[in-house]
């Protein structure tokens, strides 16, 4: 706290310039109206005040608004968002995408504080949905945003922002999380037509079903390994040597690099030997000819 | 451009443990996977094993079962290998090495770490 | 596992002599699972060519892979000073990936 004293004569702040980087910070704290600062917190930024100066110029703000900031305050703080605490930020009631925009630019190029995750968070309840332009704006700060949140919070992500969704968004979702948006991206392209459609369900893939990748092997999609290997195990454990190779296309050859790492290897434990020769890849550990497969939850199912 | 960065020199006691990490960039991570090389001179070349950034899955040469563990952190794109339990024997230079998913080449090779095990 | 033995292990050329060096493998490897590298001393090894024969991004035109089953070689149809290096095959065709004990190919 800074001890109030009176403002020596002559050094009332009519306005926010340059000349109060030379006001010591008691000074600042007698010297500087409240409510001026607030009209005019668009020039702090352009005035290279010290942290203990930006100190000051806070605790003038929440003096003056204990309740929390005013949007119109809040979309000029600049690097003084930077002083702001999460508990600070929880009192905001933020609505413009251009005052978030302002806030995240400040922080641009950092890992996502605790100050910019309650901000972001703040932001998304008041919408009541993650919309389209609001998941571009975060996804262009934030890559990783999209895998940051739970199954629970991506449900509320409306099909329509998926187009938003760039394949690097989606790069450290886990499974769990893609379970969730593959639906959504299913819904969302699903008038387009085949192979622009594969282009853009591609990056969501690692949530799809066996009978999806049943449906895709039949379109010439020519999968990737890197696509493939993303894939649920338990979606590709039922599709048969056949589908595999319509579904990689001459992709298939990638196989062999891959023989040892899920889903291919449990894949291929699930595969005759004699139908694994037929791809010439030289793939070991299938069935062996003759050795009957019983499917013992087929049996627990009937019994 | 891509680029597989790796740490300094290590010089390390025997019986001790060694993270060497591996900073990729340029590339997209989750696209390759990672395989570790040791290069010697007694004994040339040898595949340690590798690491899908994907799943986290991982497979070793046996010979190096118990003596690496391979990991990833996707938020930094950074692979590492750890050593532990190091003789002399150890003492070599540690390549990581990116290897495209579906090919078994490595198409680009970090800067490599030497790793001189004395005591 | 399968062993890859290269010969010569060292060997020097003069410019403009044509190279062949040999891959050996213990047992049969399927031509896509074989590749070669190169390492200048003090550097990272770089792949030159992968399945055999394909050369890789910016290796010169003058080098050239082939082989079948368990014989492989690497060719450079003239030697210049900038060739000078060793020579590691690779092969993926089993488990553990293996590598061959290299050539150190010097200029005359």
């Known amino acids: 706290e800074v001890e109030k004293t009176a403002c020596p004569s002559g050094k009332k702040a009519r306005e926010i310039d340059e000349s109060l980087i030379f006001y010591k910070k008691w000074e600042l704290e007698a010297c500087v109206d409240a409510a001026l600062l607030a009209t005019q917190m668009d020039r702090v930024n352009a005035i290279p005040f010290t942290y203990e100066q930006l100190d000051v110029l806070k605790h003038k703000l929440d003096e003056l608004y204990p309740q929390g900031y005013p949007e119109s305050v809040i979309q000029h703080l600049g690097y003084l968002f930077l002083k702001m605490s999460p508990e600070d930020i929880r009192k905001w009631n933020v609505t413009s995408l251009e005052t978030l925009k302002a806030l995240l630019e400040v922080n641009k190029g950092h890992e996502m504080s605790p100050q910019v995750a309650t901000l972001i968070d703040r932001f998304v309840k008041g919408r009541g949905q993650l919309d389209k332009d609001t998941l571009d704006t975060l996804t262009a700060f934030y890559p990783g945003y999209l895998c940051s949140l739970s199954p629970e919070e991506l449900s509320s992500v409306p099909p329509s922002s998926i187009w938003a969704v760039r394949p690097q968004d989606l790069d450290t979702c886990d499974p769990r999380q893609l379970d969730v948006l593959y639906p959504k991206a299913r819904l969302a392209f699903q008038n387009m037509n085949g192979s622009e459609y594969f282009v853009k369900i591609q990056s969501f893939l690692g949530g799809a079903p066996t009978e999806d990748l049943k449906a895709l092997s039949q379109q010439n999609v020519s999968m990737d390994l890197a696509t493939f290997m993303k894939l649920r195990t338990d979606a590709v454990l039922p599709l048969t040597v056949a589908e595999v190779q319509k579904l990689l296309g001459p992709h298939v050859e990638g196989l062999k690099a891959e023989e040892r790492h899920r889903p291919v290897r449990d894949w291929i434990l699930r595969q005759r030997q004699d139908d694994l020769d037929t791809l010439g890849l030289g793939l070991q550990g299938g069935i062996p000819n003759g050795y009957l497969v019983l499917d013992l939850s087929m049996q627990e199912a009937l019994s | 451009e891509v680029q597989l960065q790796q740490s300094g020199p290590e010089l390390v006691k025997p019986g001790a443990s060694v993270k060497i990490p591996c900073k990729a960039s340029g590339y997209t991570f989750t696209d390759y996977n990672m395989d570790w090389v040791k290069q010697s001179h007694g004994k040339g070349l040898e595949w340690i094993g590798d690491?899908?950034?994907?799943?986290?899955?991982?497979i070793y040469n046996q010979k190096f079962n118990g003596k690496a563990t391979l990991t990833v952190d996707k938020s930094s794109s950074t692979a590492y290998m750890e050593l532990r339990s190091l003789t002399s024997e150890d003492t070599a230079v540690y390549y990581c090495?990116?290897?495209?998913?579906?090919?078994?080449?490595?198409?680009?090779w970090g800067t490599g770490t030497t790793v001189t095990v004395s005591s | 596992q399968i062993v890859l033995t290269q010969s010569p292990a060292i060997m020097s050329a003069s410019p403009g002599e044509k190279v062949t060096l040999t891959c050996s493998a213990s047992s049969s490897v399927i031509s896509t699972y074989l590749c070669w590298y190169r390492q200048k001393p003090g550097s990272s090894p770089e792949l030159w060519i992968y399945?055999?024969?394909n050369l890789a991004s910016g290796v010169p035109a003058r080098f050239s892979g082939s082989g079948s089953g368990t014989s492989y070689s690497l060719t450079i149809s003239s030697m210049e000073a900038e060739d000078a290096a060793s020579y590691f095959c690779?092969?993926?065709?089993?488990?553990?990936?293996?590598f061959g004990g290299g050539t150190k190919l010097g200029m005359k």
């Open positions: 690779h092969q993926w065709s089993n488990y553990p990936y293996t």
């Open positions: 690491i899908n950034p994907n799943t986290d899955d991982t």
């Open positions: 090495s990116r290897r495209l998913i579906g090919t078994g080449y490595f198409d680009v």
């Open positions: 399945s055999t024969s």
